[in-house]
Interface confidence: low
């Protein structure tokens, strides 16, 4: 039965003579006259089992003391700590040269835990032990004892266990404590990696490389390794683990971020408070949820505040210049907390009679500098149709506008472009040709660009080649040209006029009047 004594964490005790209750019962040779088990009292009046020998008067002493079998427990090297008191030979009266101030320490490896006798030739010498000059004075009961402590090591060991032996060659000595232990590097956590109990190597300079395992809720950054030194101390840690997302290092552990905090990545940073306009409702959050009406763009870092779409632009002003419109506006009152605001222009062409019937303007309209993604608060729109109702919407957008289910970030203005000269008339037809007259009809211009006030028909005899022409004006899209010469080729041009002026003449229509009183009906541009 052994009592509990406290030793360094890196030492595993295999034998401690001071922890044994009752007699030690080690084997001595000779059985009498050599080593003797004696109980003395320590400072707490507790008995200590010691072995003493003081055969200093007789020469050629050879007294052996052997321990019980000691299990190796996987250790390749063990340490023997001996606390002893040894008297100076000079302090012993009448002792001649036979007195010694040393004793010898031996060991013998064996798989047999029941060997009854000491066979000296089986034992291997570890060292000769002498009293150190520096000793600890310990109060043992009513006496001050000069207590020396010596530690030796032995290895590599390979059998299941071993015996220790002490050889006295003529000293006056008391073994107060014998402790046998091996060294381990104790379980430890360094840089969030746990390193297991590791028995030291076989020799005093060996290093045992040990790979650590990351503590719960952490992952390797660099492979965590340490070396277990022969003295049972961990040497130079390499690599480390990092707390997983949603966890931070606290007291050497990776603990979940508290509610209201988060950590997005596996780093050595601590959990951060949720950014503005966001929250976390569980421990271990890797990101925070945006408040209602607030959003986070795809490329927004988890550390950025949640933001919302901007409000509508303000103070939209339009300036119409013929078929161009310049629009200018002010930034929204609320940018949603973002810097990436831009503007999109939506152009709609609306009917004069029913302004609600609008349709997109199409690709013919041009925007300067651009239609979408405007960074400035003005735009110039050109190539519009004249005398047309347009509605322009200016949309304020930012990185989270696309997440908004109820957009209300636009301001609009409706304008009518100025009248302009009409386009040319595409088709002029001779509907009826007689000897003295031609009945003409035509279509309205593709782009009237305003209210058509009248049409102007210019005609001349072909061989006169426009040196002498006549003009007829009409509000209708047809007219009868009378007073022509029979059997004569005439060229006709038609153009339209709005308040803004005349358009271009149509392509020439060539018609030849008849020689007989009959009528000729023609649709072609060059009736003959």
């Amino acid at each position: 039965v052994t009592g509990s004594r406290v030793y360094p964490a890196n030492e595993v005790t295999l034998l401690d003579s001071r922890s044994v209750q009752g007699e030690l019962g080690w084997i001595a040779s000779p059985l009498e006259g050599g080593w003797e088990e004696v109980s003395i009292m320590d400072e707490k009046n507790t008995p200590i089992r010691t072995y003493q020998v003081c055969n200093v008067m007789e020469p050629s002493q050879n007294n052996w003391l052997r321990t019980d079998w000691i299990t190796r427990e996987g250790a390749q090297r063990v340490y023997i700590e001996i606390k002893f008191t040894l008297r100076d030979c000079n302090s012993l009266p009448g002792v001649m040269g036979t007195c010694k101030e040393t004793f010898n320490l031996y060991y013998y490896e064996s798989d047999n835990d029941k060997e009854r006798f000491i066979r000296e030739n089986q034992f291997v010498k570890i060292d000769t032990i002498a009293a150190d000059e520096s000793f600890t004075q310990v109060d043992i009961g009513d006496r001050i004892m000069k207590l020396n402590t010596e530690i030796r090591d032995v290895g590599p060991l390979s059998k299941k266990g071993f015996y220790l032996a002490f050889q006295d060659v003529g000293a006056c000595i008391a073994l107060v404590s014998v402790r046998v232990f091996y060294k381990k590097c104790p379980l430890t956590v360094r840089n969030l990696a746990q390193f297991p109990d590791t028995i030291t190597g076989a020799d005093t300079s060996s290093l045992v490389e040990v790979r650590g395992s990351c503590v719960n809720n952490s992952e390797e950054k660099d492979v965590p390794k340490m070396y277990c030194g022969a003295d049972g101390e961990w040497l130079v840690p390499i690599g480390n683990c990092l707390c997983n997302a949603g966890h931070e290092e606290r007291s050497g552990e990776c603990q979940a971020c508290k509610i209201g905090y988060y950590k997005a990545l596996s780093t050595d940073a601590t959990c951060a408070k949720c950014p503005p306009h966001s929250y976390s409702v569980w421990e271990g959050a890797t990101s925070c949820t945006c408040d209602r009406g607030f959003f986070r763009a795809d490329n927004d870092a988890a550390s950025m505040p949640c933001t919302r779409p901007p409000s509508a632009p303000l103070n939209l002003i339009s300036n119409v210049n013929e078929t161009s419109v310049n629009l200018e506006w002010s930034s929204p009152q609320n940018t949603g907390g973002r810097q990436d605001i831009s503007y999109n222009v939506v152009c709609k062409k609306c009917g004069a009679g029913d302004p609600s019937k609008c349709r997109p303007c199409g690709s013919g309209v041009h925007y300067t500098p651009q239609q979408n993604g405007l960074k400035t608060t003005k735009v110039s729109i050109t190539d519009l149709l004249a005398h047309t109702n347009y509605t322009f919407e200016i949309w304020a957008v930012n990185g989270v506008s696309k997440y908004n289910p109820n957009p209300d970030q636009s301001v609009s203005v409706t304008v009518t472009t100025n009248q302009a000269a009409p386009s040319s008339i595409a088709l002029v037809q001779a509907k009826e040709v007689t000897r003295y007259s031609v009945a003409l009809a035509w279509l309205e211009p593709d782009r009237p660009n305003g209210v058509i006030l009248e049409y102007e028909v210019k005609y001349y005899e072909k061989d006169q080649n426009e040196r002498s022409y006549r003009i007829v004006r009409t509000a209708a899209r047809n007219t009868d040209i009378k007073g022509l010469n029979p059997l004569t080729s005439y060229v006709f041009h038609v153009r339209a006029r709005t308040a803004a002026g005349y358009g271009d003449f149509s392509e020439p229509l060539e018609v030849t009047t008849n020689t007989v009183p009959s009528r000729i009906i023609g649709d072609g541009a060059n009736s003959t």
């Epitope: 964490a9 840089n191 005093t204 300079s205 030194g229 101390e233 961990w234 050595d268």
Partner: antibody, heavy 121, light 106 residues
Framework: QVQLLQSGAEVKKPGASVKVPCKAS????????MSWVRQAPGQGLEWMGW????????TYAQGFTGRFVFSLDTSVSTAYLQISSLKAEDTAVYYC??????????????WGQGTLVTVSS | EIVLTQSPATLSVSPGERATLSCRAS??????LAWYQQKPGQAPRLLIY???TRATGIPDRFSASGSGTDFTLTISRVEPEDFAVYYC????????FGQGTKVEIK
Amino acid sequence: QVQLLQSGAEVKKPGASVKVPCKASGYTFTSYAMSWVRQAPGQGLEWMGWINTNTGNPTYAQGFTGRFVFSLDTSVSTAYLQISSLKAEDTAVYYCARVRTTVYGDGMDVWGQGTLVTVSS
Amino acid sequence: EIVLTQSPATLSVSPGERATLSCRASQSVSSNLAWYQQKPGQAPRLLIYGASTRATGIPDRFSASGSGTDFTLTISRVEPEDFAVYYCQQYGSSWTFGQGTKVEIK
């Protein structure tokens, strides 16, 4: 007792080399790493790196690669710092220090007395 | 690399007074921090390792605390032999020293 003994002051010309020894005694030389620390005149301490006395494997701090070499002679329990192509800005006291690593933390628990290297033309 | 910033640069105290020195890391070094004392013309001396563990032979008037990024060295009652420069040093990632705090007689 445990101690580290360094050589006396050195005066070198720019471009020359210097080899600073650090002899250990009083403990098992190969049980502790050896660190090197620089201190320019009137300045603070700068960690240069360390060498594993078991394997001879050196680790250099930023700014101390190339011209600086750590080496060992375990038979005489001595670590060396060699600096080549010396520059005026290498003028400093160079310390060796034993690295003690325990369960509770690391520290340089035993220091040499330092070697002053002066680089001057 | 991790930068250690010590404050104040100079601390003036009278013998018997309490001295508090600060060391702040640019990122967490856990408890991987040591404190050293250096007197003029001498090599540095290890005072504290593991952020708070006194080295062998260091008087108990020296104490230290902190972890992560903020660390403190306290001398409870300054003795005449304590006037020196004090350095913090981290070994969490590579090794670096602070720029030092000089403790001088007031």
